[in-house]
């Protein structure tokens, strides 16, 4: 589906976006350092990891998923665990690290070109031509290159993460892409949830900064589902 | 420090013609998106539309759609909207809006009156 | 039209904390958990005050916090002060057509 290409915490396998540049694939992955796992959770070391208890994979961080830590173990007992990696093993999509996806039992990245026709399609449904000048992809707002001079300031327009300043990300917010804070601990983050398709992800927001991951808000563990925040925490 | 200021408000009849102005000094201009808003006398806040950094895209109120227009001038560092058809509803402070993350800096707007 | 709902006053004493709520739906505030707040003198024009539910722009008091909670969001001022005195309105976007959306406002009094 198209949530296991946009993983909105991230900010890193983004499609070709309304502000962006389609004819740039490779672009999703040129964010700022220390945000693309390759090898899965950074932070998930032996010495420092702390087991974190879950029903579900939205309860964990966007580099993890919820399952029971031993084979065949008891289905009760399950805890977050660090995302496979490419042609690692996997049973569904939220096993994988951002930017694949479970395809025949496996870990495989994910294929923009793929999903660009489900893309363009949650794009002139939501965007309407009636309503602005954009139509699907055929008009796109580009940026040019004099523009990369100097570091975005928060706020200005973007490609990817490697044009803002330290301490920001390239990341989507509503109409374009822009240069957004990284997040600091108790902000509000996104976990993507891969279940499902929901559209074109519009809003984005940076990742959790250094060692902070983001994880459902402690109290709102009672709430409905679809009402519950995540926040940047300690691991 | 950023600075937006705002002009060309008065009064005009309904049905008659407007445009407003909005110079932009303090930031990189070119690379913002900038939003015009509005407020009623006494009333709320209402969005009108929003111009890409490039003007490659533009959006507007279901209010205003067919009878404003939003335009930038990037080498002037200046917003537009013109006003056209206009309706006694439409009176208003009109604000232009630097929108980065929303609406993070404003101008003192400009006021506009409709009434014959 | 289209608008988040907000009490339309508020008010406290100096010290005091207050708490303004914005409603919406599962088609702007809800679906995005996403708000922003804005604060208003008379005769002047907005300040933005909190944005993406409770990040604080730079220069804005940490008086100010932002939360929310399913369609609801809610901005608390604590240790009240006079200058805090203004009107206050959430924002969101709705989903189609994308488009932002303001609260009605709500005129906090100190009292």
């Known amino acids: 589906t198209l949530n296991s290409v946009l993983n909105s915490n991230a900010i890193k396998n983004l499609p070709p976006p309304l502000g962006g540049a389609a004819g740039h694939p490779g672009s999703a992955v040129s964010a700022a350092p220390g945000i693309l796992y390759p090898g899965g959770n950074k932070y998930q070391t032996i010495d420092n990891y702390q087991p974190y208890p879950c029903a579900e994979d939205e309860e964990c961080g966007t580099d993890e998923y919820c399952a029971s830590p031993t084979r065949g173990g008891d289905a009760g007992v399950q805890i977050c665990l660090a995302c496979r990696k490419r042609r690692k093993r996997c049973m569904r999509h939220a096993m994988c690290c951002p930017g694949n996806y479970c395809k025949n039992g496996i870990c495989v990245s994910s294929d923009q070109n793929h999903f660009r026709g489900e893309i363009e399609e949650t794009i002139t449904e939501s965007f309407g031509n009636d309503h602005s000048t954009l139509d699907g992809y055929s008009r796109r707002t580009t940026l040019s290159s004099k523009m990369y001079h100097t570091k975005g300031q928060e706020g200005s327009v973007c490609l990817r993460s490697s044009d803002c300043a330290s301490g920001l990300c390239c990341a989507r917010h509503f109409w374009s892409k822009i240069c957004k804070p990284v997040l600091k601990e108790g902000q509000v983050c996104t976990k993507h949830r891969r279940k499902g398709s929901h559209g074109l992800e519009i809003f984005q927001r940076c990742y959790c900064g250094e060692g902070l991951s983001c994880r459902i808000q402690k109290d709102h563990h009672q709430a409905s589902n679809s009402s519950r925040l995540h926040t940047c925490q300690r691991h | 420090q950023v600075q937006l200021v705002e002009s060309g408000g008065g009064l005009v009849q309904p049905g008659g013609s407007l445009r407003l102005s909005c110079a932009a000094s303090g930031f990189t201009f070119s690379s913002y998106w900038m939003s015009w808003v509005r407020q009623a006398p006494g009333k709320g806040l209402e969005w009108v539309s929003v111009i890409s950094s490039d003007s490659s895209s533009t959006y507007y109120a279901d209010s205003v759609k067919g009878r404003f227009t939003i335009s930038r001038d990037n080498s002037k560092n200046t917003l537009y909207l013109q006003m056209n058809s206009l309706r006694a509803e439409d009176t208003a402070v009109y604000y232009c809006a630097r929108h980065g993350i929303d609406f993070d800096h404003w101008g003192q707007g400009t006021l506009v009156t409709v009434s014959s | 039209d289209i608008a988040l709902t907000q009490p339309a006053s508020v008010s406290g004493s100096p010290g005091q904390s207050i708490t303004i709520s914005c409603t919406g739906t599962s088609s702007d505030l809800g679906g995005y958990n996403y708000v922003s707040w804005y604060q208003q003198h008379p005769g002047k024009a907005p300040k933005l005050m909190i944005y993406d539910v409770n990040n604080r722009p730079s220069g804005v008091s940490n008086r100010f916090s932002g939360s929310k909670s399913g369609n609801t969001a809610s901005l608390t001022i604590s240790g009240l002060q006079a200058e805090d005195e203004a009107d206050y309105y959430c924002?969101?976007?709705?989903?189609?057509?994308?488009?932002?959306?303001f609260g009605g406002g709500t005129k906090l009094t100190v009292l």
């Open positions: 924002q969101s976007y709705t989903y189609t057509p994308i488009s932002p959306v």
